[in-house]
Interface confidence: low
């Protein structure tokens, strides 16, 4: 969560030729007010579409009277800042809409009215927690001049307002896998808790409680795997309707790394690798010392006293990049052997094996008859990591304990009775039926269809079935 | 000033369920700390049972963990304890504490003495 | 789950002496990313609730006098008071916090000689 701040410095008549008239006067003062508008991402959109990251209206600024044959000058503004809050994480590349409105006060029926005098848009790279950002923009003959930041609400921090810290009573006093939340030393980052049962493997999030699903993944705790047969493109966003993967632009089209920085994707989106002197989501950030802190993940800091010499990252184990800011993925060796799935807890990997494995890396396969005897001469059949009995017949249940009860699938055909017999069963068959489960009819010139009963039967005798 | 204080009752029938809350005064529940439960058997030494993060989050003591049940009332800033199957070996005094997100445990109730007995 | 041993179980000191209790856990409690070892110590007297001394090993817990140090690394630690004070006197425990399951010593009790 966080905030994003607008500071309007002028607004009046841009350079060159044709000034614009003076939207107030004598016979019909006026004053201004502004509105913004954010959405996310860097998309073109109408003005009109939803502003999903926010808006937000200035006050109302000075009453405003046009002095008779006077150009028109920078018009007076309203007071403070515009202040657009944001619950989630700040998404670093942002579209805006900046409008500026006039109110006429003069004898309306009804109140004041309301007219547009100005809309200026544009598309943004902003850091969360960065400097402000001086903006000219220009609106048919008038200019407006603003900076903006986007700042984090305690207790989130970072580029993205998705790290959350809080001040502690001594320094530094963070646990496992929670850095202090730089630049403030007595601030720890506070453990991002996931939704309940999301997928360590493919399922992150950005707020506690959440649980965001890796690109191929979904399903509420991201345990589901995205089918790509029919797809053509492995890229871009899942569509939930087909279950697949719909073609998309790649993160890196266009290179957003500023600065010279190197793009690759990734599975989230894409990841910027930054020269020197730069870092940040998009490498947007300069002029960096050691005094700034630019190393993260508990990074050592060396050299770098001034903004023109370069400082060096030494990384912890498990982290690289200039500024140590990429977390080794260890899990992509692929440690776990039969199917185990891996943990990367930061201080060390873990495998979390699958029922009938065991060891480090899951490289035991136990013996699932070891041990286990099936009785009533059932033999032990070993497979998927757990044991079942091949029973003798006549018995049935998981240690063949149980005597099955053999003419529980009613064996005998054509209405035949059947009777449960110490080796198996027995068909006493209807008249006109012969066969061990009564399946021959009798032809009726005696005959049957099939070879005549075995010696010492007749037809309807109880044929047992051995 | 961070004050913790346990309530519940002091007696409690073998096989029942020994309840505790905890209330914190002086931090909100939903800071960056970890809330603990650890006991303490008369004449013996202290017992880690477990903690919960305020999003609903717990870590358990493995020998209790199929007893225990640790939950969060934000809008109470209070936190409670659930043990099940209680014998007279769970009889101790019961202390809540508030882990510092390093994990030591920095500030503590006075405890609350349980008993098992019929 | 990583076991926690103290030793000596009693120790018995003359007012003014150094005192030192050792801690063995039965892995290493050092978290190499930020070369930090996730121990505390605690003093506890009778009838009351057990007090944070020292955590990361040797960083004090403000407030407390500072004739009590913690050192150690890795599986071995001590905790020493420079000069026993009558106030001293009671049971002092170690425990690791390191990773979601924490265990604390058995306990060794201070008493004046």
């Known amino acids: 969560a966080g905030v994003f701040e607008l500071q309007i410095h002028s607004f009046g008549p841009g350079p060159g030729p044709g000034a614009p008239r003076s939207p107030c006067s004598a016979r019909l003062p006026c004053r201004l007010f502004f509105r913004v508008c954010l959405k996310p991402g860097l998309s073109e959109e109408a003005a009109e579409s939803p502003c999903a990251l926010g808006a937000a209206l200035s006050a109302r600024g000075p009453v405003y009277t046009e002095q008779p044959g006077a150009p028109a000058p920078d018009l007076p503004l309203p007071d403070g800042l515009l202040q657009v809050p944001f619950r989630d994480a700040w998404p670093g590349t942002f579209s805006f809409i900046i409008e500026t409105w006039r109110e006429e006060l003069g004898d309306q029926i009804g109140g004041p009215a309301w007219s547009l005098l100005a809309r200026v848009a544009g598309r943004r790279r902003l850091a969360a927690g960065g400097p402000w950002a001086r903006d000219i923009q220009r609106a048919g003959a008038w200019e407006l001049r603003f900076s903006y930041r986007a700042r984090c609400e305690p207790p989130a921090v970072g580029t993205a307002c998705t790290r959350l810290c809080r001040p502690r009573s001594a320094p530094s006093r963070c646990g496992p896998g929670l850095r202090p939340c730089a630049p403030l030393e007595d601030e720890c980052e506070a453990p991002l808790v996931c939704r309940a049962g999301c997928s360590p493997e493919h399922g992150f999030c950005e707020q506690p409680g959440e649980c965001r699903c890796l690109e191929g993944w979904t399903g509420p705790l991201c345990t589901v795997p995205v089918s790509t047969s029919s797809c053509l493109s492995p890229r871009g966003p899942s569509s939930a309707t087909t279950g697949c993967l719909v073609p998309g632009p790649g993160p890196c089209d266009g290179n957003p790394c500023a600065n010279g920085g190197s793009c690759s994707e990734t599975p989230r989106s894409f990841e910027c690798t930054c020269p020197r002197g730069f870092y940040g989501l998009r490498c947007e950030v300069s002029g960096v010392t050691c005094a700034d802190g630019p190393c993260f993940n508990g990074g050592l800091c060396v050299g770098g006293a001034d903004p023109d010499s370069a400082y060096i990252c030494h990384c912890p184990p498990g982290f690289q990049g200039s500024n140590c800011e990429k977390r080794v993925d260890r899990c992509s060796l692929q440690p776990c052997r039969n199917g185990g799935l891996c943990l990367d807890l930061g201080h060390a990997l873990r495998c979390r094996c699958r029922a009938g494995f065991a060891g480090p890396r899951c490289e035991h396969d136990l013996d699932d008859c070891a041990g286990r005897a099936c009785a009533n001469g059932g033999t032990c059949v070993e497979g998927g990591g757990a044991h079942r009995c091949s029973c003798a017949l006549g018995f049935g249940g998981r240690d063949c304990r149980e005597r099955a009860d053999p003419c529980a699938a009613r064996p005998c055909a054509h209405g035949g009775r059947c009777y449960a017999h110490f080796s198996g069963l027995v068909c006493a068959c209807a008249p006109g039926y012969m066969g061990a489960r009564c399946e021959f009819p009798v032809h009726p010139d005696g005959a049957s269809a099939l070879p005549a009963a075995p010696p010492g039967l007749r037809p309807g005798d109880p044929q047992r079935y051995l | 000033q961070v004050q913790l204080q346990e309530s519940g009752p002091g007696l409690v029938k073998p096989s029942g369920t020994l309840s505790l809350t905890c209330v914190v005064f002086g931090d909100s529940i939903s800071s960056s700390n970890w809330w603990s439960w650890v006991r303490q058997p008369p004449g013996k030494g202290l017992e880690w049972i477990g903690e919960?993060?305020?999003?609903?989050?717990?870590n358990y003591n493995p020998s209790l963990k199929s007893r225990v049940t640790i939950s969060v009332d934000k809008s109470k800033n209070q936190f409670s304890l659930k043990l099940s199957s209680v014998t007279a070996a769970d009889t101790a005094v019961y202390y809540c504490?508030?882990?510092?997100?390093?994990?030591?445990?920095?500030?503590w109730g006075q405890g609350t003495l349980v008993t098992v007995s019929s | 789950d990583i076991v926690m041993t103290q030793s000596p179980d009693s120790l018995a000191v003359s007012l003014g002496e150094r005192a030192t209790i050792n801690c063995k856990s039965s892995q290493s409690v050092l978290y190499s990313s930020n070369n930090k070892n996730y121990l505390a110590w605690y003093q506890q007297k009778p009838g009351q609730p057990p007090n944070l001394l020292v955590y990361?090993?040797?960083t004090r817990e403000s407030g407390v006098p500072d004739r009590f140090s913690g050192a150690g690394s890795g599986t071995d630690f001590t905790l020493t008071i420079s000069s026993l004070q009558a106030e001293d006197v009671a049971v002092y425990y170690c425990q690791q916090y390191y990773g979601t399951s924490w265990t604390f010593g058995q306990g060794t009790k201070v008493e004046i000689k």
């Open positions: 919960v993060f305020h999003s609903g989050s717990t």
């Open positions: 990361w090993a040797s």
């Open positions: 504490a508030r882990a510092a997100v390093a994990g030591a445990l920095d500030y």
